[in-house]
């Protein structure tokens, strides 16, 4: 059970992760006017990866879109790649996670395959976490810079004579939105790649014993005291008694007539 | 259409105070900024403030700091002026503008309001 | 505070004439966000109040006649008046409504001949 609900928190805490990662990269307000000593101008001014916006103080709103892709600076390029390849992996990583859910059955597949599918979009969550948190950090450290360029050249214009008023940035609402949102598909990616231990079935040197009764067709498994009709496919090279103590999880990882296909 | 409706003087005594007035109509008060412009005789402009009458969120020319109140009453579609202290220097047209919606710039102005101090 | 510089002052034109005047703002009014000009040109008539001609320094208000054109960037703007008529006497203000406070030019009294 605990493996269970530790596959499926992760899974939750990833789509939310992953959801946020996709609204932070779509956000506008990635950098925003500073207007730390009251407003300096009468438009707010703030910038996304993909467009800037100008919101007169009206309230009208005009958003331009960066038309270019050369003359952008590398940073904001590399910001996008990042934040892209993290949305990418991520909804491929939900894609695998999906199918490697213990609550959800598709045809006949082995628990290793699911543990094999949970390990899988684990990695790809946390890549994508990371993804998200670096392409944040990087923009973020750029805005730093820039800030304090500007607040140094703030006053100082040629050979200090002229004064100039500069538009300083700082953090927007969408850095925050990547860095938690970043750091739940990390979280996530974490709980899948515990969940995966849970789910990997433990190697044992005990083989499945069939035992025929005469008038029926019935195999019997004494490990998990769980019968199927006929001689199909999954009385064959099945482990079915490892041993040692057994978990509520891996009970339920056998098919019985309680399993909903 | 818009219309800003001022009255037409106001005669004060030095050291008094006067509030000014700008009935709007012909449009939504609490959408667009309301503007306030001083213009002493045969000089040019100068800008007070401005009052946003929505949620009464100004801003002021430090200058006219202490010197001018800017207040609006959305039951009536107003906005008020109160001029503080007044000297001669403060004897001056005073205009009440609506902020246009896609500038900063100022599209429909009242009359104008002559502010005389004298004792 | 921004300082508008304005010139000349007066400028006496006849009817039917071009006429340019100058605005100059001591510091730039574009704004890199949407490489737009707050800069705008009013023009008031004797005994009137002023009237809004043109906005975001070449953005001709409704109703204006096109012989009115403003045209500038960053610093330095200009307006004309393509073919001047009698009823444009009048002074014309420049206006920055980019920084605040707002600030006005000391105005260009165009004077016709």
């Known amino acids: 059970m605990a493996v269970t609900a530790c596959q499926g928190l992760g899974f939750v805490v990833s789509l939310i992760g992953i959801a946020g990662i996709i609204a932070a990269t779509c956000m506008d307000q990635w950098s925003t006017q500073d207007l730390y000593n009251n407003p300096v101008t009468a438009v707010f001014n703030y910038q996304g990866l993909w467009r800037s916006c100008v919101r007169e103080s009206s309230g009208f709103t005009e958003c331009r879109g960066y038309f270019t892709l050369l003359g952008l600076p590398a940073m904001l390029q590399a910001v996008r790649a990042l934040m892209i390849v993290g949305i990418v992996l991520g909804a491929i990583g939900l894609l695998v996670s999906i199918f490697a859910l213990k609550c959800i059955r598709i045809g006949s597949m082995e628990d290793s395959a699911k543990a094999n599918m949970t390990l899988t979009s684990g990695i790809m969550f946390i890549v994508s976490g990371l993804c998200a948190i670096a392409g944040v950090s990087v923009f973020a450290n750029m805005l730093v810079t820039n800030f304090w360029m500007s607040t140094a050249n703030m006053y100082t214009g040629m050979g200090g004579m002229v004064q100039t008023v500069q538009t300083r940035y700082t953090f927007g609402a969408a850095l925050f939105v990547g860095w938690v949102a970043g750091g739940l598909t990390l979280i996530g990616g974490v709980m899948m790649c515990i969940a995966c231990r849970g789910l990997a079935p433990e190697e044992t040197n005990y083989k499945a014993v069939s035992y025929h009764a005469s008038g029926h067709s019935v195999a019997y498994k004494p490990g998990g005291f769980k019968a199927s009709t006929g001689f199909g496919s999954n009385t064959k090279n099945k482990k079915i008694y490892d041993g040692g103590a057994r978990t509520e999880d891996e009970v339920q990882s056998y098919p019985s007539k309680h399993d909903y296909v | 259409q818009v219309q800003l409706q001022q009255p037409g003087t106001e005669l004060v005594k030095p050291g008094a105070s006067v509030k000014v007035s700008c009935k709007a109509s012909?449009?939504?008060?609490?959408?667009?900024?309301m503007h306030w412009v001083k213009q002493r005789p045969g000089q040019g402009l100068e800008w007070i403030g401005r009052?946003?009458?929505?949620?009464?969120?100004?801003n002021y020319n430090q200058k006219f700091k202490g010197k001018a109140t800017l207040t609006v009453d959305k039951s009536s579609d107003t906005a008020y002026m109160q001029l503080n202290s007044l000297t001669s220097e403060d004897s001056a047209v005073y205009y009440c503008a609506m902020g246009a919606y896609f500038s900063n710039s100022f599209a429909y102005w009242g009359q104008g309001t002559l502010v005389t101090v004298s004792a | 505070d921004i300082v508008m510089t304005q010139s000349p002052s007066p400028l006496t034109v006849i009817v039917g004439e071009k006429v340019t005047m100058t605005c100059k703002s001591s510091q730039t009014l574009l704004n890199r966000g949407n490489q737009k000009n707050y800069l705008t040109w009013y023009q008031q008539k004797p005994g009137q109040p002023p009237k809004l001609l043109i906005y975001?320094?070449?953005t001709r208000e409704s109703g204006v006649p096109d012989r009115f054109t403003g045209s500038g960037s960053g610093t330095d703007f200009t307006l004309t008046i393509n073919s001047v008529q009698a009823e444009d006497l009048a002074v014309y203000y420049c206006?920055?409504?980019?920084?605040?406070?707002?600030?006005f030019g000391s105005g260009t009294k165009l004077e016709i001949r």
């Open positions: 975001w320094a070449s």
């Open positions: 206006q920055n409504d980019y920084f605040f406070p707002f600030t």
């Open positions: 012909g449009y939504t008060f609490t959408t667009y900024w």
């Open positions: 009052i946003r009458p929505s949620d009464s969120d100004s």
